[in-house]
Each structure stands twice: as C-alpha cells, then as structure tokens.
C-alpha cells in the first residue's frame, strides 16, 4: 500500500466564486475516496466534479475532485480522503 499525497488548490471562477480542487497522487491501490465537505457534512454528488483515477506512470495512481464555493467561505470547506484504512481532512488554503 502506498498512501496518497493530497494537495488542495484554489482558483478564481466567476465574480464572488472560487473553484477549490483537491488532488491525490502517488497512491496504490486505486480505490480512494476523495470528496468535499461543508461544515463537516458531505456535499451532494451533483455539486462536485471528479477526475478519473488514472495511472501516473510510476505504478501508482492520481485523481482529483473540485467544487465551486463562495469567496470568503473557504474555512467552511474541507477535502476528505479515505484510502486503505486511513483517512485525513484537508482545508482550503487562505
């Protein structure tokens, strides 16, 4: 088992909104849970966009999940990761 590296980034979307993206890379096996939470509660599937889990060429995998949020509310959102019996949460950088 190889645990993922998780990285959260932000980018401007439209006026007053930002897109936050959570990337996991370098993990094995492929089956990983990666999703966004607001105030500790899961966001619905239809408010998130997922990348496919893809091989990264090193025998491990990478994927991402993104969602659009209101600027100024970043502290309410966290990216949640589960992989091979381990879990972690990752905040949006300010």
């Amino acid at each position: 088992t190889v645990p993922p590296m998780v990285n959260v980034t932000r980018s401007e979307a439209s006026e007053g909104n930002i897109t936050v993206t959570c990337r996991a890379s370098g993990f094995y096996p492929w089956n990983i849970t990666l999703s966004w939470r607001q105030d500790g509660v899961s966001l619905s599937h239809d408010t998130q966009q997922w990348g496919d889990v893809l091989p990264d060429g090193n025998g491990t995998y990478q994927t991402w999940v993104a969602t659009r949020i209101c600027q100024g509310e970043e502290q309410r959102f966290t990216c949640y990761m589960e992989h091979s019996g381990n879990h972690s949460t990752h905040p949006v950088p300010s």
Epitope: N31, H45, D46, Y80, E82, G85, T89
Partner: antibody, heavy 120, light 107 residues
C-alpha cells in the same frame, strides 16, 4: 470476506428509543463508511444515514432530529440510535457498507437486516 | 428530495424472457444511479452501479442503461434465481433515495 450483521431488540414500545448494532468483519471501519437503510413491511427502502471512516456522519434530514450514528472501530461495530419511535418506524433495518470512488457511490455489501416492531 | 419512480410495481415473465424494468427521477441525476436486487427472504445485493457498471460476480445477463431522468435495468434471459424485487437508487443529491421497487415473478 466482507460481512455485516445487525442485532436489535425486536420489539420497542411507542415513544421509546431504538438501539441497533451492526458488527462488521472483513474490512476496517477506520477506512470505509457504513450506511443504515430501513424497509417498512411491504414498502420500499429508505436511507437513514451513514458514518464515514473518520467518524463524521451524514443523516437523512427528515429523520436527523431523532437519529444518532456512532461506532467503535476497535470492536468493529456501528451503532444506530433512534428516539421517539412510533408505529410507522416498524421496519427491517439494514446496515450496508458504502463504497465511494469518485463518481461512483454504492452500497456494495448488506447485512441480512433486523426486524423492529413498534408496538405496546 | 429527489423522487424515484418505478411505475411497474410487479411483472410476470417466463423463464428465458428479456425483462426490462424502468425507473425515472424527478430531476436530472447525471447517471448517478444504482440498482439493487432483494430476494423474497430479504437479502439485498448490489446489481448495477453508476447506471451501467456490473460488480464482479453479477451475471452478464444483467445490464443497465439510461441518462438524465430515465433509466432501465434489463435481464436478458430470465432465470429462476432472478425472482426478486429490484430497486433503483439515486445518489446525485443527499439523501440517496430509492424507487418503490419492481417485483419480478414467473408466469
């Protein structure tokens, strides 16, 4: 081999609370979520809520005020507690493992269920 | 909540028949749909996930299709062990919701 087994009281008096235990084997509660689903006699399935690997919970908002889901990772047990039971809470209660991989979220292994009857 | 409707609550078919079960959502669910089989004694099993993906161990006579609000489950060659109730379930929005079920019986 992944297995889940529910155990409950069978009979609960109206206005009392319900406690059901789901004991799992073949996977770690620290790394996967467990859902609760119920089915009233002759009716369809209703999702009650779930607990994630880190202990966070999501609930069906229609029942949130009466529901509590918790777990004990070391004993491989998940607990459902529901307060203020009425006769329409009579149902078969199932626990099911949740698999959440990107666009895919499904309940891949289910327990056999435990029947709960609310009656005086 | 998103309402899932299975208009046919029960159907009778002969062994070897092709059986199609329909399910409609009250809004677009973007293929976020699963199917479950419940045997008469209550055992529930995942049959199809994400509209058309088959879990390992599920016979290839089962298939799923659809998009938007309309989805279907097809059993291409009905066998005795397929006698069960079938439920669709959306997970586009929380809470996940199930259809009312379609009971398949032998004619």
């Amino acid at each position: 081999q992944v297995q889940l087994k529910e155990s409950g009281p069978g009979l609960v008096a109206p206005s009392q609370s319900l406690s059901i235990t789901c004991t799992v084997s073949g996977f770690s509660l620290n790394g996967q979520g467990v859902n609760w689903v119920r089915q009233p006699p002759g009716k369809g399935l209703e999702w009650l809520g779930m607990i994630w690997g880190d202990g966070s919970t999501d609930y069906n908002s229609a029942l949130k005020s009466r529901l509590s889901i918790s777990k004990d990772n070391s004993r491989s047990q998940v607990f459902l507690k529901m307060n203020s039971l009425q006769t329409d809470d009579t149902a078969r209660y199932y626990c099911a493992r949740g698999a959440h991989y990107g666009k895919r979220w499904y309940f891949d292994v289910w327990g056999a269920g435990t029947t709960v009857t609310v009656s005086s | 909540d998103i309402q899932m409707t299975q208009t046919t609550s029960s159907l009778s078919a002969s062994l070897g028949d092709r059986v199609t079960i329909s399910c409609s959502a009250s809004q677009n669910i973007n293929n976020y749909l699963n199917w479950y089989q419940q045997k008469p004694h209550g055992t529930v099993k995942l049959l199809i996930y994400y509209t058309s993906s088959l879990p390992s161990g599920v016979p290839s006579r089962f298939s799923g299709s659809g998009s938007g609000t309309d989805y279907s489950l097809t059993i291409s060659n009905l066998e005795p062990e397929d006698i069960a109730s079938y439920y669709c379930q959306q997970y586009s929005k929380l809470p996940p919701t199930f259809g009312g079920g379609t009971k398949v019986e032998i004619k």
